[in-house]
Interface confidence: medium
């Protein structure tokens, strides 16, 4: 921000009525009136260029310093070219001297040169040559000097002429202030510029109404330089929750808008499924039936739990069931849907039911599922199972109601036995099998069916209560088709795959485990 100038003295604005002191009296400097741009202007002028040594002084009236520490002196003046005078005016000069004196009182007409301290020799950038003078082109020079620190109640300026042809058209004395400033939503008070060029006065700012220093942020500070300019801003304020920045102020969010934290962002429109907010809202309440999860940002629409999975199928495969479903038709406005599968089993004879989580095996953990299928295995035969698939999202925990779909399936067969060849010889095959332990108690016997590969007319059957059998009296180097099936009280269980096992050739005698 530009410095603010506080004027202490302005000769040009005074219309010739300041009555400055000239020394020696009646010689040298003189108050003159002229016309410029059709306006009367006053100037203090001296032009004793032909008279040898000159020592003409012009002293201002006493100027009250007030709060100024460093003053700036702006001079507007014109100086004639010494060569424009006949004979070149050998004693003519083209500069004058600027002085000042501090005092606690006005000395009136008591002028003492010795009290004055020289500030500088003032030289023009442009002198007025003959042609300019005769054409009445005033070559106006502007020079500025500064003095400080000042300590007394007031001061005088003085101008010493040493033989120049000079006119002072304007003498303006002022000091500088860093103006009152609103920046970064902080208010900085008007501050007097310091007097020492290298130093910067640190000024603390205060946050404007409804603005705060953000957590972990720096308090607002600025530095007031000698020239009255604010420099090096540090820290800032932000509009608090419920308020937004409008120009240099924080304004309450309009009804229907909200802002949930102190930030630079503007108020946001209340999201979908919220009630209209009042002025200055920090959040927007959810409509009835809609909720906001703890981790949901305030800018997110309110959401609700999902509807039940749309379509659920349970396909039984022996002692396994594949559950498949489609996502809910209404997601509740969220994408964080997960599924939970629960299982209940019922005994057909007694009609008793109970949870079956402990006795079945899932292809993946049944809670927090993101996919829409799961396989349940280790099911017991001749049992009724009911599977429940529940859809949940981030706000399901905020309501007591649940969104689920169920599917029931009856397991009528045992799971097919898993068959292995344990050993073989030229005339025998040793075969073993297994079924899931929960189903073993329901099996009465196992039936092993075998025949030569390619012979569809005859086959052999062996029954056993155990989990293995040795098939004897077989032909050497011959492939047999073997299948094992569990027999239960209710009938046949699921048959295993048909396996191809080959006896050894006569050359490869001995019992060989495979």
């Amino acid at each position: 921000a530009q410095g603010k100038e506080v004027v202490l003295l302005d000769f040009a604005a005074a219309g010739g009525e300041l009555g400055w002191l000239t020394h020696p009296y009646g010689k040298g400097w003189d108050l003159m009136q002229n016309i410029m741009n059709d306006m009367p202007i006053y100037m203090y002028s001296v032009c004793n260029v032909m008279s040898g040594d000159q020592d003409n002084w012009l002293r201002t009236n006493w100027v009250y310093r007030g709060e100024a520490e460093r003053i700036f002196i702006e001079l507007k003046f014109t100086v004639r070219d010494c060569n424009s005078f006949p004979g070149g005016a050998s004693s003519c000069k083209e500069t004058f001297n600027l002085y000042y004196a501090e005092s606690d009182l006005d000395y009136g007409t008591n002028f003492q040169k010795r009290l004055f301290t020289k500030i500088d020799t003032i030289a023009p950038d442009e002198i007025t040559v003959s042609s300019d003078f005769e054409a009445r082109h005033v070559k106006l020079n502007v020079e500025e000097r500064s003095v400080g620190p000042l300590t007394r109640k007031g001061f005088y300026l003085a101008f010493q002429d040493i033989g120049a042809c000079v006119a002072l058209l304007s003498v303006r004395v002022y000091y500088k202030k860093c103006p009152e400033l609103l920046q970064g939503l902080a208010h900085f008070p008007e501050t007097i510029a310091g007097s020492d060029a290298p130093s910067l006065a640190t000024v603390a700012g205060t946050c404007v109404d409804h603005a705060v220093v953000p957590p972990g942020g720096e308090e607002p500070r600025m530095h007031c330089a000698v020239d009255g300019e604010w420099l090096v801003p540090i820290g800032q304020c932000l509009c608090q929750a419920g308020y937004e920045k409008v120009e240099d102020a924080c304004q309450a969010c309009s009804p229907g808008f909200f802002k949930f934290e102190a930030s630079e962002s503007p108020c946001l429109e209340c999201p979908e499924h919220t009630l209209p907010s009042p002025e200055g809202a920090t959040s927007c309440e959810c409509e009835e039936g809609f909720f906001r999860a703890p981790q949901d940002p305030a800018s997110m629409p309110c959401t609700r739990p999902p509807s039940a999975p749309h379509y659920l199928t349970a396909v039984g495969m022996g002692a396994k069931v594949e559950l498949r479903w489609t996502p809910p038709q209404d997601s509740g406005g969220r994408e964080d849907i997960v599924y939970s599968v629960t299982c209940e089993q019922c005994w057909p004879e007694s009609g008793e039911c109970g949870p079956c989580e402990a006795s079945v095996r899932y292809s993946e953990p049944p809670h927090g599922l993101t996919r829409t299928s799961v396989t349940v295995s280790d099911l017991e035969p001749h049992m009724n199972y009911t599977f429940t698939v529940e859809a949940r999202n981030g706000v399901s925990g905020l309501v007591t109601s649940r969104s689920f779909r169920t599917a029931s399936v009856s397991i009528n067969q045992t799971e097919p036995p898993k068959v292995r060849l344990e050993g073989r010889s030229t005339t025998s095959l040793s075969v073993s099998w297994s079924i899931p332990p929960p189903q073993q108690s329901r099996v009465w016997k196992y039936e092993v069916t075998y025949r030569k590969k390619g012979d569809s007319n005859s086959y052999n059957v062996r029954r056993t209560e155990g989990f293995s059998v040795t098939l004897d009296d077989l032909a050497p180097d011959t492939t047999y088709l073997v299948q094992v099936q569990a027999l239960t009280q209710e009938g046949q269980g699921a048959g295993s795959k048909v396996h191809e096992f080959q006896t050894l050739s006569p050359e490869g005698s001995g019992n060989l485990a495979v």
Epitope: M32, N34, I35, D38, M43, S45, V46, C47, V49, M50, T78, V79, R80, S84, F85, P86, T128, S130, S131, F133, E134, A135, R136, V138, C165, V166, A167, L169
Partner: antibody, heavy 128, light 107 residues
């Protein structure tokens, strides 16, 4: 006593040339701004040209620009007006006039181009 | 160029009369105006400069006034020696211009 005496007037044909002189005495010629002012028979005064105390700057009325040249010789206290390409409308009494620029020992000039002193004039007639 | 218009172009008056001649500039010339008196066959003489300042040796019955664009020359008690033609002249800009003259004749 200030005296200005013009000479060099006469009859000249259109397109011809004349040189007017003005001899000054009784004052410090080099301090004076000098000018030529003319007056056609039975008409009013018309400013023609001026020259500064040290020989510059020079200025001319639009009606004579490019044809007339003003000059001075301060060592001879004489002012000149060289007139070329003369026209019938240049027929007039030509006065030499002066203003004491000693007044100009000031830092900022007020305009001061009125004429304190005048010569008696010399008649220039342009006719075929 | 600045035009200077004098009025009247001529006037008849008696000795002792108060006579006023006006001069109007086509644009403001502040107070940069002079008045001259010219008698037949003679060179002009300076009467007034800077609109109102009396030139050395000019009788005090002559006075000038005005600024901007309106100026006047007043002869407060006309004398036999005052019958002549009077010219105003602006010197605000380098192209010096004179009025067309006002002839003061004996009534």
């Amino acid at each position: 006593e200030v005296q200005l005496l013009e000479s060099g007037g006469g009859l000249v044909q259109p397109g011809g040339s004349l040189r007017l002189s003005c001899a000054a005495s009784g004052f410090t010629f080099s301090h004076y701004m000098m000018a030529w002012v003319r007056q056609a028979p039975g008409k009013g005064l018309e400013w023609v040209s001026r020259i500064g105390p040290s020989g510059g700057p020079t200025h001319y009325a639009d009606s004579v620009k490019g044809r007339f040249t003003i000059s001075r010789d301060n060592s001879k206290n004489t002012l000149y007006l060289q007139m070329n390409s003369l026209r019938a409308e240049d027929t007039a009494v030509y006065y030499c006039a002066g203003y004491d620029s000693g007044y100009d020992y000031v830092a900022v000039a007020g305009p001061a181009e009125y004429f304190q002193h005048w010569g008696q004039g010399t008649l220039v007639t342009v006719s075929s | 160029d600045i035009q200077m218009t004098q009025s009247p172009s001529s006037l008849s008056a008696s000795v002792g009369d108060r006579v006023t001649i006006t001069c109007r500039a086509s644009q403001s010339i502040s107070t940069w105006l002079a008045w001259y008196q010219q008698k037949p066959g003679k060179a002009p003489k300076l009467l007034i400069y800077k609109a109102s300042n009396l030139h050395t040796g000019v009788p005090s019955r002559f006075s000038g006034s005005g600024s901007g664009t309106e100026f006047s020359l007043t002869i407060s008690g006309l004398q036999p020696d005052d019958f002549a033609t009077y010219y105003c002249q602006q010197y605000n800009v380098y192209s010096r211009t004179f009025g067309q003259g006002t002839k003061v004749e004996i009534k």
